[in-house]
C-alpha cells in the first residue's frame, strides 16, 4: 500500500487556446484530472487501473502552482493503491477549461480540452521527486511525482507491513526495510522474549518483562539460584528444592520439633500446663474455661451460634443473651413477624410461606444457610478435623491443618514414630498418642534405650533367711552367702531338713 | 448536444476492403476515447476496439487484430474503422461509441450504427 | 477470451424493483473490471447507463444503479416504469479489451 505523489508546479498556456486550436472565452480557467495506470510501452485508452484524481480551478491561462501540502491542500496530489507497486506505470495528465464551477464533463463546454500530456516509466518507492516537464504544441507543464509507502507499509514495493508496537504481541519498531527493530529488553523473532535480568538462572528463572527475574518453583533468590526448603521447613536446609535436612537439635518431617518443645516454645497459652508428650510432641493441660491445642480458646456458651435468623450473641456470666434483629423475637430470636412479603431471604434465597402466611421458610442456595440465608456455609463447624487439627475454610472446600504426629485429610492417620526404629539396642517401640515409648532390654535405659547400665542382681533381694547377696559383675548374676544353719543356692532350707521333692 | 453521426449503409463484394465513419460533436473530440462495436443479427454486441484520439493509441480485440483498422482525423473530429478481406461473417450493424478512462469507460453515447452488407 | 453471461430474459411490472446481473467466466467480477451497462431500444438506440460499476452516466434517470453482489454485476431498476423495456448489455474489462455478454431482454407488464 502506497501514493503516487504529484505535484503540480507551473503551467504556461500563453496564447490561452484549446487543444482544437479555438481560443477560451474569456481565458482558459484550467483544471486537471489526472490518470494513472499500469506500465503501457504505447499509451493507449482504458480504465485508469491505479487511480484517477482532479483538481478544481487552479488558474487562468498561464499559472505557477503553490505547493498546498502544509495547509491541507490538495498539491501535491494523492493517488493511493493498496497494491504491491510494480515499480512501472503510466500517468496522463488532461487540462481542461471550465468557464462556471462545475466541473462535471457534462457541465462542460462542447469545445473543453486545453491539453493531454502522458508519460509512462519505471519509478521506484522513495522519498526524491523526479521533475519533469512536459511541452505540446502550445502549452508547457512543469510538474514532479514520486512514490511513498502507506503508514506501516515499507520495502522497495511497499508490499511488507509492519506496525510499530509494544504490547503483548511485540516490543518493536520498524526499520525502512521492514524488518522489526526490538525495543531495548527485548529478543526473538518478533521481540516478544524479555531478556531477563542479568545472572538469572537458565534453568531456575524466567521473566515476563525486562531486567526481571522471576523463580521458577522451588527458587528463590535475586538470581534463582537458592533452593526452596520444603514449606513449613523451620530448622533446617535444602540443597534441591522442597528438602528439610535438620539442624542439629531438631527433628521431624519439617524440623520443627524439639526435644525440649514446652520450654523451649511455650506453646500452651492461658496458664496451662505444658508437658512433653515424646520427642517432637507436647500436650497442653488447659485450666477450666479454656480448650483448644494450645488451650488458646476461650470457652464460650456462644460458640454454639444458638441465636437464629441473625441474632447476635452475646456472654452473659450465667449464661448468653441474643440480640435479635427487626422482625424477630424469642430467646434464640426464632419467632419471626415477618412473612415472605417483606424479602426476608438474603443471598438469592427463595421464600416458602408456611402457617397460612404467619411464618415463612426460606430455602438457601448453595453455599448459604441460617434460616433468611444469612450466613456463608463454615465447613468447619462440624469440627471435621481429628487428632486435634485445626480445620480452615478455603472458599467452596476446606482443609486440615493437622498437628505434629498425625497426617491424612482430616488428620486421622497417625503417623508411626516407631516406623524409624528409634529404640536402641534391641528396645522394643510402642507408638503412643501424643510420640512413641521404648522398652529397654536388661542393661539399657534411657528414652531411646541409649544407656548402657550395670545390672544390680541383688536389687531384687534374691536371698533368704538373712544371707548376704553379692554380684558378679562378669556375669550379671548374684551369689547368696549362707549364714549358718541354712543351705541351697538362695539359703533356702534349714540344714538337717533335705528339701521335699514331690516323688 | 453530443451527437455521433455515423456514415451510411455499404454492400460490399467478399474480399473488398470498406472505410466507415463516425463524425462527433458537441463535446472535445480528443478527450474521449472512441469505441466501435459490432452487432450481427440485430442481437448480441462484440466489441471490436477503441482509440484514443489525443495521442492516437489503440486496443483491439484480439479476434479482429489484421481484420479492423482504427483512425482518426482530429481536425474534423471524425473516427473512422476500415474493414479489410471482407466476407459475408462481416455482414454487420457497426457501432461507433465514446467513452471516457476517468469514470470506468462509461459507453454513454452511441452513433446510429452502419449496416455493411458483403454478398457477391 | 473471457464469456460474459446475462439472464436472457426477465418479466417486471411497473413500480417493481428488478435486478438484472452480469457473470464472468473467470471468476467473480471485481471494481477492476469496470462493469458497464448499456440499454438498446428499439430502432438501434443505444444509451450508456453505468460506468465503472456504478457511476451513472449524465441524464440516467436514479432509479438505474450499478453495484456488486456476490460474485457477479449488477444492474438495479428500481421502481421499473414502461419506457424501461429494452435490452441491457452489460460489457466487463479485462487488462486491455472489453468483453460484451449476450444481453437481457426486460419486459415491463403495462
Known amino acids: 500500500s502506497g501514493v503516487f505523489q504529484l505535484q503540480l508546479q507551473e503551467f504556461i498556456n500563453e496564447r490561452g487556446v484549446l487543444a482544437s486550436g479555438r481560443p477560451c472565452e474569456p481565458g482558459c480557467r484550467t483544471f486537471f484530472r489526472v490518470c494513472l495506470k499500469h506500465f503501457q510501452a504505447v499509451v493507449s485508452p482504458g480504465p485508469c487501473t491505479f487511480g484517477t484524481v482532479s483538481t478544481p480551478v487552479l488558474g487562468t491561462n498561464s499559472f505557477a502552482v503553490r505547493d498546498d501540502s502544509s495547509g491541507g491542500g490538495r498539491n501535491p496530489l494523492q493517488l493511493p493503491f493498496n497494491f504491491t507497486w510494480p515499480g512501472t506505470f503510466s500517468l496522463i495528465i488532461e487540462a481542461w477549461h471550465a468557464p462556471g464551477d462545475d466541473l462535471r464533463p457534462e457541465a462542460l463546454p462542447p469545445d473543453a480540452l486545453i491539453s493531454k500530456i502522458a508519460i509512462q516509466g519505471s519509478l521506484a518507492v522513495g522519498q526524491n521527486w523526479l521533475l519533469d516537464e512536459q511541452t505540446s504544441t502550445l502549452t508547457r507543464l512543469r510538474y514532479s511525482y514520486r512514490v511513498i509507502c502507506s503508514d506501516n507499509y515499507y520495502g522497495d514495493n511497499c508490499s511488507r507491513l509492519c506496525k510499530k508496537r509494544n504490547d503483548h504481541f511485540g516490543h518493536y519498531v520498524c526499520q525502512p526495510d521492514g524488518n522489526l527493530s526490538c525495543l531495548p529488553g527485548w529478543t526473538g523473532e518478533y521481540c516478544q522474549q524479555p531478556i531477563c535480568l542479568s545472572g538469572c538462572h537458565e534453568q531456575n528463572g524466567y521473566c515476563s518483562k525486562p531486567a526481571e527475574c522471576l523463580c521458577r518453583p522451588g527458587w528463590q533468590g535475586r538470581l534463582c539460584n537458592e533452593c526452596i526448603p520444603h514449606n513449613g521447613c523451620r530448622h533446617g536446609t535444602c540443597s534441591t528444592p522442597w528438602q528439610c535436612t535438620c539442624d542439629e537439635g531438631w527433628g521431624g518431617l519439617f524440623c520443627d520439633q524439639d526435644l525440649n518443645y514446652c520450654t523451649h516454645h511455650s506453646p500452651c497459652k492461658n496458664g496451662a500446663t505444658c508437658s512433653n508428650s515424646g520427642q517432637r510432641s507436647y500436650t497442653c493441660t488447659c485450666r477450666p474455661g479454656y480448650t483448644g491445642v494450645d488451650c488458646e480458646l476461650e470457652l464460650s456458651e456462644c460458640d454454639s451460634n444458638p441465636c437464629r435468623n441473625g441474632g447476635s450473641c452475646k456472654d452473659q456470666e450465667d449464661g448468653y443473651h441474643c440480640l435479635c434483629p427487626p422482625g424477630y423475637y424469642g430467646l434464640h430470636c426464632e419467632h419471626s413477624t415477618l412473612s415472605c412479603a417483606d424479602s426476608p431471604c438474603f443471598n438469592g434465597g427463595s421464600c416458602r410461606e408456611r402457617n397460612q402466611g404467619a411464618n415463612y421458610a426460606c430455602e438457601c442456595p448453595p453455599n448459604f444457610t441460617g434460616s433468611n440465608c444469612e450466613k456463608k456455609v463454615d465447613r468447619c463447624t462440624s469440627n471435621p478435623c481429628a487428632n486435634g487439627g485445626q480445620c480452615l475454610n478455603r472458599g467452596p472446600s476446606r482443609m486440615c491443618r493437622c498437628r505434629p504426629g498425625f497426617t491424612g485429610t482430616y488428620c486421622e492417620l497417625h503417623v508411626s514414630d516407631c516406623a524409624r526404629n528409634p529404640c536402641a539396642h534391641g528396645g522394643t517401640c510402642h507408638d503412643l498418642e501424643n510420640g512413641l515409648m521404648c522398652t529397654c532390654p536388661a542393661g539399657f535405659s534411657g528414652r531411646r534405650c541409649e544407656v548402657r547400665t550395670s545390672i544390680d542382681a541383688c536389687a531384687s533381694s534374691p536371698c533368704f533367711n538373712r544371707a548376704t547377696c553379692y554380684t558378679d559383675l562378669s556375669t550379671d548374676t548374684f551369689v547368696c552367702n549362707c549364714p549358718y544353719g541354712f543351705v541351697g543356692s538362695r539359703c533356702e532350707f534349714p540344714v538337717g531338713l533335705p528339701p521335699s521333692f514331690p516323688w | 448536444e453530443v451527437q455521433l453521426q455515423q456514415s451510411g449503409p455499404e454492400l460490399e463484394k467478399p474480399g473488398a476492403s470498406v472505410k466507415i465513419s463516425c463524425k462527433a460533436s458537441?463535446?472535445?473530440?480528443?478527450?474521449?476515447?472512441m469505441n466501435w462495436v459490432k452487432q450481427s443479427n440485430g442481437k448480441s454486441l462484440e466489441w471490436i476496439g477503441n482509440?484514443?484520439?489525443?495521442?492516437?493509441?489503440?486496443n483491439y480485440n484480439q479476434k479482429f487484430k489484421g481484420k479492423a483498422t482504427l483512425t482518426v482525423d482530429k481536425s474534423s473530429s471524425t473516427a473512422y474503422m476500415q474493414l479489410k478481406s471482407l466476407t459475408s461473417e462481416d455482414s454487420a450493424v457497426y457501432y461507433c461509441?465514446?467513452?471516457?478512462?476517468?469514470?470506468?469507460?462509461?459507453?454513454?453515447?452511441w452513433g446510429q450504427g452502419t449496416t455493411l452488407t458483403v454478398s457477391s | 477470451q473471457a464469456v460474459v453471461t446475462q439472464e436472457s430474459a426477465l418479466t417486471t411490472s411497473p413500480g417493481e424493483t428488478v435486478t438484472l446481473t452480469c457473470r464472468s467466466s473467470?471468476?467473480?467480477?471485481?471494481?477492476?473490471?469496470?462493469a458497464n451497462w448499456v440499454q438498446e431500444k428499439p430502432d438501434h438506440l443505444f444509451t450508456g447507463l453505468i460506468g465503472?460499476?456504478?457511476n451513472r452516466a449524465p441524464g440516467v434517470p436514479a432509479r438505474f444503479s450499478g453495484s456488486l453482489i456476490g460474485d457477479k454485476a449488477a444492474l438495479t431498476i428500481t421502481g421499473a416504469q414502461t419506457e424501461d423495456e429494452a435490452i441491457y448489455f452489460c460489457?466487463?474489462?479485462?487488462?486491455?479489451?472489453?468483453?460484451f455478454g449476450g444481453g437481457t431482454k426486460l419486459t415491463v407488464l403495462g
Open positions: 461509441a465514446r467513452n471516457y478512462d476517468y469514470d470506468g469507460g462509461c459507453f454513454d453515447y
Open positions: 482509440i484514443d484520439p489525443y495521442f492516437g493509441g489503440t
Open positions: 458537441g463535446y472535445s473530440f480528443t478527450g474521449y476515447n
Open positions: 460489457a466487463l474489462w479485462y487488462s486491455n479489451h472489453w468483453v
Open positions: 465503472g460499476t456504478n
Open positions: 473467470t471468476g467473480a467480477v471485481t471494481t477492476s473490471n469496470y
